[in-house]
Interface confidence: low
């Protein structure tokens, strides 16, 4: 631009563009000032007067330097399955994200339009892939030797306990039940090793040929729930 052109509005030289934070007004054929975030153009510029800006009203915003005649409306209040992570101000829209235990099934430019509950894996199934902010849980059937007896979006399949004498064999949805002899657990990651190991061998077959006796009513169950997987997930 020529040195003498300092203030808006001004006519740009042919082929040149307006400066930063200015816009070309097609009606006035002039470079004019943009309005700052939180404002909008109340009166557009003319050949002799610059843009007149005004503050956005309540529940409206502009996030960028602009020359819009009206501020944008903030999105509606967050729904019950959402958390407001950014409030509506004159310079930014409200942002709603999904609350814990939910994921975003339909996203928008910022935040989430539609949240959905994370899938819960039913007994016999464990979490194969945890849920994230934008993806649901993926469940998988528990493999032989593992089980899940919960309906959960976080629990994975855990290994059956290993008994010296099995009272009831485990399946995909139930742990093995041992006789009154203290059970041991396989050394799978995250598995709990209970006291009184019966043998250094981990095996699912009975170590002695005697038939099992009737189960005791005071058999040991796994100690506490398995640690939750990262994020959350389901069926």
């Amino acid at each position: 631009l020529p040195a003498q052109v300092a203030f808006t509005p001004y006519a740009p030289e042919p082929g040149s563009t307006c400066r930063l934070r200015e816009y070309y007004d097609q009606t006035a054929q002039m470079c004019c000032s943009k309005c700052s975030p939180g404002q909008h153009a109340k009166v557009f510029c003319t050949k002799t007067s610059d843009t007149v800006c005004d503050s956005c009203e309540d529940s409206t915003y502009t996030q960028l330097w602009n020359w819009v005649p009206e501020c944008l409306s903030c999105g509606s209040r967050c729904s019950s399955d959402q958390v407001e992570t950014q409030a509506c101000t004159r310079e930014q829209n409200r942002i709603c994200t999904c609350r814990p235990g939910w994921y975003c099934a339909l996203s928008k430019q910022e935040g989430c339009r539609l949240c959905a509950p994370l899938r819960k894996c039913r007994p016999g199934f464990g979490v194969a892939r945890p849920g994230t902010e934008t993806s649901d849980v993926v469940c998988k059937p528990c493999a032989p030797g593992t089980f899940s007896n919960t309906t959960s979006s976080t629990d994975i399949c855990r290994p059956h306990q290993i008994c010296n004498v099995v009272a009831i064999p485990g399946n995909a949805s139930m742990d093995a039940v041992c006789t009154s002899t203290s059970p041991t657990r396989s050394m799978a990651p995250g598995a709990v090793h209970l006291p009184q190991p019966v043998s250094t061998r981990s095996q699912h077959t009975q170590p002695t040929p005697e038939p099992s006796t009737a189960p005791s009513t005071s058999f040991l169950l796994p100690m506490g729930p398995s640690p939750p997987a990262e994020g959350s997930t389901g069926d």
Epitope: A11, P12, P14, G15, Y24, Q26, T27, Q29, K47
Partner: antibody
Amino acid sequence: QIQLVQSGPELKKPGETVKISCKASGYTFTTAGMQWVQKMPGKGFKWIGWINTHSGEPKYAEDFKGRFAFSLETSASTAYLQISNLKNEDTATYFCARWDGTGYWGQGTTLTVSS
Amino acid sequence: QIVLTQSPAIMSASPGEKVTITCSASSSVSYMHWFQQKPGTSPKLWIYSTSNLASGVPARFSGSGSGTSYSLTISRMEAEDAATYYCQQRSSYPPTFGGGTKLEIK
């Protein structure tokens, strides 16, 4: 580089309709308005009007209100001039040009209206 | 609307000769713009905002004026300057053009 390329010559009969296109390239189409200018044989230029390529709002000179209409296909960076119910006196070369004083004009489209 | 009257309508000049084309407005305008057109081509912006030469225009051209009286001057005519020149105002709606001055080389 910036270019405005217009559609080819047209031969029409009175009463018919013609639609002339002006395809812009080399710049963001919605940043500059588009004007249309008429040049009749042996005469000077007459300004038909202009269209705001951002809002789509057209403005016509008094002499061209009614049968002349501007339109846009923003996705194709193209402006159109449509003239309906053609008359012999519409015979002219029609130019599109950027409405910003930069001096970019199309090559012109010759329209001949004759029975 | 503002009427622009150019004079002369046609003129011829010898190489090296000084040429002046005038444009008179029916009402005062802020600026005058000039276009050059050669047969079979679209008009080219030649001088904008009264006195600024458009890109690629030789320095022998100049523009001046104010109010209702404007002019385009060629200090030394050259063969390539033979063309029709049009003045245009955009200060008042609608924009209008002069009738043109056809400049020929002798």
